[in-house]
């Protein structure tokens, strides 16, 4: 069965070819300690932010 949480993400090469891979479908992010997990929207917002930061690190030609 294909991973939902542990999907290998391709390294970012350039902004144009970047795709964000997320867990598909309803995901319950609760942990063994019973914490209430993040919502899908929260996860997506964090992923977008991380992606944006990574893109900003890419040196652009002068």
């Amino acid at each position: 069965m294909r991973n939902i949480f542990k999907r290998n993400q391709e390294p970012i090469v350039a902004p144009a070819t970047t795709t964000a891979t997320m867990p598909i479908g309803p995901v319950d992010n609760s942990t063994e300690s019973g914490g209430a997990g993040e919502s899908q929207e929260d996860m997506f917002a964090k992923l977008k932010e991380k992606l944006f930061n990574e893109i900003n690190k890419i040196p652009l030609p002068p």
Epitope: M1, R2, N3, I4, F5, K6, R7, N8, E10, T19, T21, I24, G25, P26, V27, D28, N29, S30, T31, E32, S33, G37
Partner: antibody
Framework: EVQLQESGAELVRPGASVKLSCKAS????????MHWVKQTPVHGLEWIGA????????AYNQKFKGKATLTADKSSSTAYMELRSLTSEDSAVYYC???????????WGQGTTLTVSS | DVLMTQTPLTLSVTIGQPASISCKSS???????????LNWLLQRPGQSPKRLIY???KLDSGVPDRFTGSGSGTDFTLKISRVEAEDLGVYYC?????????FGGGTKLEIK
């Protein structure tokens, strides 16, 4: 050698709960997800859900939400599936199968036969 | 949920003859990453399922090259060029592109 050893056959009464186990060996337990599949003559193979043993994160097929609860014990490299409020519809063979990236080696347990009968 | 429809239900084949199984999905299995997560497995009598083919056409290790998988989008086919006695059992296609993952109903291969 990767092995997934599932618990033995169970005969339980309607309304009861049961906890099936899947002990992993031959690899680092927390590096791979564990998925569970139900098999019946009527409905064939059905994907129940998955757990990431590293974080405890779970994902369920909507059909099995409220019926199945997936957990994992890192110390014993064992994944568990608890099934509650059992009915005859839950009588099936249940398999654990190791998650992959859609292309690496695929491993399945030998299956646990659950019979719900009064 | 993605409906996976397999045909035929039963296939009776003479050893040495070819066999073909069709699997159709209710929506395209092409993922956003450009890959198509369509798999085939064989369940021999009294055994656990064993994956034969992944990503439509790639053979798992140890699977004889008489097995070939093909197709794209919503239409897929598993072919056995020359059936052998060890090939009997039930063949299932399944998709893990869309959530929840779903299986075909199975095709029972019998030896004539």
């Amino acid at each position: 050698e990767v092995q997934l050893q599932e618990s033995g056959a169970e005969l339980v009464r309607p309304g009861a709960s049961v906890k099936l186990s899947c002990k992993a060996s031959g690899y680092t337990f927390t590096d791979y997800e564990m998925h569970w599949v139900k098999q019946t003559p009527v409905h064939g193979l059905e994907w129940i859900g998955a757990i990431d043993p590293e974080t405890g994160g779970t994902a369920y097929n909507q059909k099995f939400k409220g019926k199945a609860t997936l957990t994992a014990d890192k110390s014993s490299s064992t994944a568990y599936m608890e099934l509650r409020s059992l009915t005859s519809e839950d009588s099936a063979v249940y398999y654990c199968t190791r998650g992959n990236d859609g292309y690496n080696e695929d491993y399945w347990g030998q299956g646990t036969t659950l019979t719900v009968s009064s | 949920d993605v409906l996976m429809t397999q045909t035929p239900l039963t296939l009776s084949v003479t050893i040495g003859q070819p066999a073909s199984i069709s699997c159709k999905s209710s929506q395209s299995l092409l993922d956003s990453d450009g890959k198509t997560y369509l798999n085939w497995l064989l369940q021999r009598p009294g055994q656990s399922p064993k994956r034969l083919i992944y990503l439509v056409s790639k053979l798992d290790s140890g699977v004889p090259d008489r097995f070939t998988g093909s197709g794209s989008g919503t239409d897929f086919t598993l072919k056995i060029s020359r059936v052998e006695a060890e090939d009997l059992g039930v063949y299932y296609c399944w998709q893990d592109t869309h959530f929840p993952y779903t299986f075909g109903g199975g095709t029972k291969l019998e030896i004539k």
